[in-house]
């Protein structure tokens, strides 16, 4: 099991990258002057206590920024949020911190990220550019839930 976060770059199938704007992650077309965030991911060390068939449970952080992705309910709808948090603090906790965990599932070159706290809800971007990352249950045309990962360093 890796004990160091793995830096990755993420883009969707429409070649949009993730950028940080006012503490919100948005997906924008890759251009010269766009500086995408580097994502850190690390597997949960308590993998034996989580469902085995949904993917690899991981924490997702923004490299060097002490921000991590989490899912929380706003009203009765799960939402994707950025929380000030050291990814290694989450990794070292004595139990899986489900609100910060995602099942990372790979099919060929495509990756999906399903919330552990809210099964059936996936990280997604709207098919229109320049929109914030969201959580969705609808794996259809309106939202993109498939992403490509490139390992860095």
């Amino acid at each position: 099991k890796s004990e160091m976060p793995q830096p990755v770059s993420i883009q969707d199938i429409n070649h949009r990258v993730w950028v940080l704007q006012d503490q919100i992650l948005i997906a924008v077309p890759r251009k010269d002057r766009v500086s995408p965030v580097t994502i850190s991911l690390i597997s949960c060390r308590h993998v034996e206590t989580l469902e085995k068939d949904r993917g690899n449970p991981i924490y997702l952080g923004l490299n060097g920024l002490n921000l991590c992705l989490m899912c929380a309910k706003a009203g009765d709808q799960p939402t994707l949020q950025l929380k000030e948090k050291d990814i290694m603090d989450l990794y070292n906790q004595p139990e899986p911190v489900k609100s910060f965990l995602f099942y990372h599932s790979q099919s060929g070159r495509n990756s999906t990220f399903e919330s552990v706290a809210f099964p059936g809800w996936f990280i997604a971007v709207s098919s229109e550019g320049g929109c914030p990352l969201i959580l969705t249950q609808e794996l259809g045309k309106a939202n993109t839930t498939d992403f490509g990962l490139t390992m860095l360093f």
Partner: antibody, heavy 121, light 109 residues
């Protein structure tokens, strides 16, 4: 209001089994971890184990492996502890507790009132 | 299996500062043991006070604080009150299992 309500006192014979319950109100047990703890008269606490009611996965203290079985029923919002092959050593108060993550750590934030188990012939 | 040891009893006076400690048989307690502190009052009333060595649980008064002192986990009550009379248990994580101490009976006279 968040509460953990445990089943009533039990008097059982050596060699028998017993199933204790812990019913949650004010929250959904599948959103947290439920821990079980044993307290013998004039002694400290012993961790029996924990269950994640969302998936049924458990962790046991090695000492209680084979003695205790934890289960959960999310439809009734209830966690269970079954104890088998009972002896006088199992005479104790058994507690369920919620182990919850807030902000930066896990805490035991709510406890049941305890179930007194007496094993006697 | 690890053994967690606490003072069996301590006495303090209202307004005084008192420190309870928690020792591990396996060596120094570190932040990796994620020390928890729990208070037991009469009639089986338990309250979680501290998690992750030094993080106060929501709603717990600021007079309770957790730390590491030397090779032990510690719970300090700054300005003890009569209602703090109780038994205090620490619990330490060892990999994937939790071990409780025997408890400290705190008397506030």
């Amino acid at each position: 209001e968040v509460q953990l309500q445990q089943s009533g006192a039990e008097l059982v014979k050596p060699g028998a089994s017993v199933k204790l319950s812990c019913t949650a109100s004010g929250f959904n047990i599948k959103d947290t971890y439920i821990y079980w703890v044993k307290q013998r008269p004039e002694q400290g606490l012993e961790w029996i184990g924990r269950i994640d009611p969302a998936n049924g996965y458990t962790r046991y203290d090695p000492k209680f492996q084979g003695k205790a079985t934890m289960t959960a029923d999310t439809s009734s919002n209830t966690a269970y502890l079954q104890l088998s092959s009972l002896t006088s050593e199992d005479t104790a108060v058994y507690y369920c507790a919620r182990y919850e993550y807030y902000d930066s750590s896990f805490y035991f934030d709510y406890w049941g009132q305890g179930t007194t188990l007496t094993v006697s012939s | 299996q690890a053994v967690v040891t606490q003072e069996s009893a301590l006495t303090t006076s209202p307004g005084e500062t008192v420190t309870l400690t928690c020792r591990s048989s396996t060596g120094a307690v570190t932040t990796s043991n994620y020390a928890n502190w729990v208070q037991e009052k009469p009639d089986h009333l338990f309250t979680g006070l501290i998690g992750g060595t030094n993080n106060r649980a929501p709603g717990v008064p600021a007079r309770f604080s957790g730390s590491l002192i030397g090779d032990k986990a510690a719970l300090t009550i700054t300005g003890a009150q009569t209602e703090d009379e109780a038994i205090y248990f620490c619990a330490l994580w060892y990999s994937n299992h939790l071990v409780f101490g025997g408890g400290t009976k705190l008397t506030v006279l």
